[in-house]
């Protein structure tokens, strides 16, 4: 905080306000100002052997101001301590301090981690993650239609990014593998792109199975296209319904 | 004279911010701390923080940590408080105070939040 | 935290009688001598206004009816003799730790 300090005139007589110039409300010539004007602060600032009072808009950095119904006083802040509302609530601690409710510490309490651009004592956070959003289309090589497998991919958001300490984020991305629906491409289909089309709930055909993301496991293998009679595929959906297995880009 | 001048009424969605402006005249804006306190309908009153308006640092009441923010411009002598992720217990009435020598001793006149969907 | 218990939560008087309203710490807010106690009244409508800084001392330009007396944990704010504008909601504050906290308030009525 920067003190505007209250200049002294020299006076002949003490306890004189008559004069006094700044914030003084009476001063003397050889000892400065002797008492402030209101909402502001005395101290005393030792030039050369001698202290002279002044008066100050602001408590200088490390100390803080008390009041009383006689004088406002600057009184020291604690050792450990740059600036303060009083001795027991630090406002920012010295160099190698954490601050933490008020309080100067070596090391932060349990529970809290230190941030050492703040140089405060904060709470640890941990990942939080949005719902997932809808599946995406069923897609084979750009294309939403057609007897081929595809995979379909959905997407999450990280609302809090954790802090040092703090839990990693789940995975953001998972993918599975999915029949593409059951329906010749048209020619103007052709290599459209599933996010082109409009999102649609499965139809009865498509079944739903799921596999790596080949963005986040780069060694795993496409599963070559089969044709299936209609028993074949009443069979794999069974079988698709009881797997859930998800691979997914963690953070 | 000390003049704190406070923005207008807010009403605000759940989940949006809200930044409430805080206006000082009549003495030198950077002699003293500006602390934001607000006061739920027919509740007590509730400590938030404080900004130095000399030099920008601020502290915040735990409970409102993660979700406050406190700034000051000094060529407009004004202080803001802004707090997000807002929910239903955020309608108050917000008031800005100095602080001088451990006691409150000028207000604003108070900005009323509501938070409504 | 420091917790600031008011007592009573509601107080009726009659004009020209005594009105007490205790603040109880829920640990020291002394320090150094000096007691980080602040009493405030706040009518409806209107911002807090302080009254009693330190515990005991008389805010500028309020009426020498207002009193405030104690240290440590317990406090006092004594009105004598209740006046009309009185009526009001009465707080304690302390300024000793962080976070800075309030009492619930003790609202005051005319019998």
């Known amino acids: 905080q920067n003190a505007s300090r209250g200049r002294r005139q020299r006076r002949m007589h003490p306890n004189v306000s008559q004069g006094c110039q700044g914030g003084c409300a009476t001063c003397s010539d050889y000892n400065g100002c002797l008492s402030c004007k209101p909402r502001l602060f005395f101290a005393l600032e030792r030039i050369g052997m001698k202290q002279i009072g002044v008066c100050l808009s602001s408590c200088p950095s490390g100390y803080y101001g008390t009041r009383y119904p006689d004088i406002n006083k600057c009184t020291k802040c604690k050792a450990d301590c740059d600036t303060c509302f009083n001795k027991n609530f630090c406002t920012k601690c010295k160099s190698g301090f954490y601050l933490h409710l008020g309080k100067c510490l070596d090391n932060c309490p349990e529970g809290l981690e230190a941030n050492n651009h703040t140089m405060e004592c904060v709470s640890i956070v941990h990942c939080e993650v949005s719902e997932w959003n809808p599946w995406s289309p069923c897609t084979k090589k750009g294309k939403t239609c057609g007897f081929k497998r595809g995979t379909e991919t959905r997407v999450r958001e990280i609302i809090q990014h954790p802090s040092a300490k703090g839990n990693l984020c789940p995975p953001t991305n998972e993918t599975r593998k999915c029949t593409v629906q059951r329906k010749k491409c048209q020619k103007g289909e052709r290599g459209k792109k599933g996010r082109e089309r409009k999102r649609k709930k499965p139809n009865k055909g498509e079944s739903k199975e799921a596999i790596p993301d080949s963005k986040s496991l780069e060694s795993s293998k496409e599963i070559p296209e089969q044709r299936e009679n209609k028993q074949q595929q009443k069979k794999r959906k069974v079988q698709d319904k009881q797997k859930s297995v998800s691979v997914s880009t963690v953070h | 004279q000390v003049q704190l001048v406070q923005s207008g009424a807010e009403v605000k969605k759940p989940g949006a911010s809200v930044k409430v402006s805080c206006k000082a005249s009549?003495?030198?804006?950077?002699?003293?701390?500006f602390h934001w306190v607000r006061q739920a309908p027919g509740q007590g009153l509730e400590w938030i923080g404080y900004?130095?308006?000399?030099?920008?640092?601020?502290g915040y009441n735990q409970k409102f940590k993660n979700r406050v923010t406190m700034t000051r411009d000094t060529s407009t002598s004004t202080a803001y408080m802004e707090l997000s992720r807002l929910r239903s217990e955020d309608t108050a009435v917000y008031y800005c105070a100095t602080y001088f020598a451990n006691n409150f001793d000028y207000w604003g006149q108070g900005t009323t939040l509501t938070v409504s969907s | 935290d420091i917790v600031l218990t008011q007592s009573p939560a509601s107080l009726a008087v009659s004009l020209g009688q005594r009105a007490t309203i205790t603040c109880k710490a829920s640990q020291s807010v002394d320090y150094d001598g000096d007691s980080y106690m602040n009493w405030y009244q706040q009518k409806p409508g209107q911002p807090p206004k302080l009254l009693i800084y330190a515990a005991s001392n008389l805010e500028s330009g309020i009426p020498a009816r207002f009193s405030g007396s104690g240290s440590g944990t317990d406090f006092t704010l004594t009105i004598n003799p209740v006046e009309a504008e009185d009526v009001a909601t009465y707080y304690c504050q302390q300024s000793n730790e962080d976070p800075l906290t309030f009492g619930a308030g003790t609202k005051l009525e005319l019998k």
């Open positions: 009549g003495y030198t804006f950077t002699s003293y701390t």
């Open positions: 900004i130095y308006p000399s030099n920008g640092d601020s």
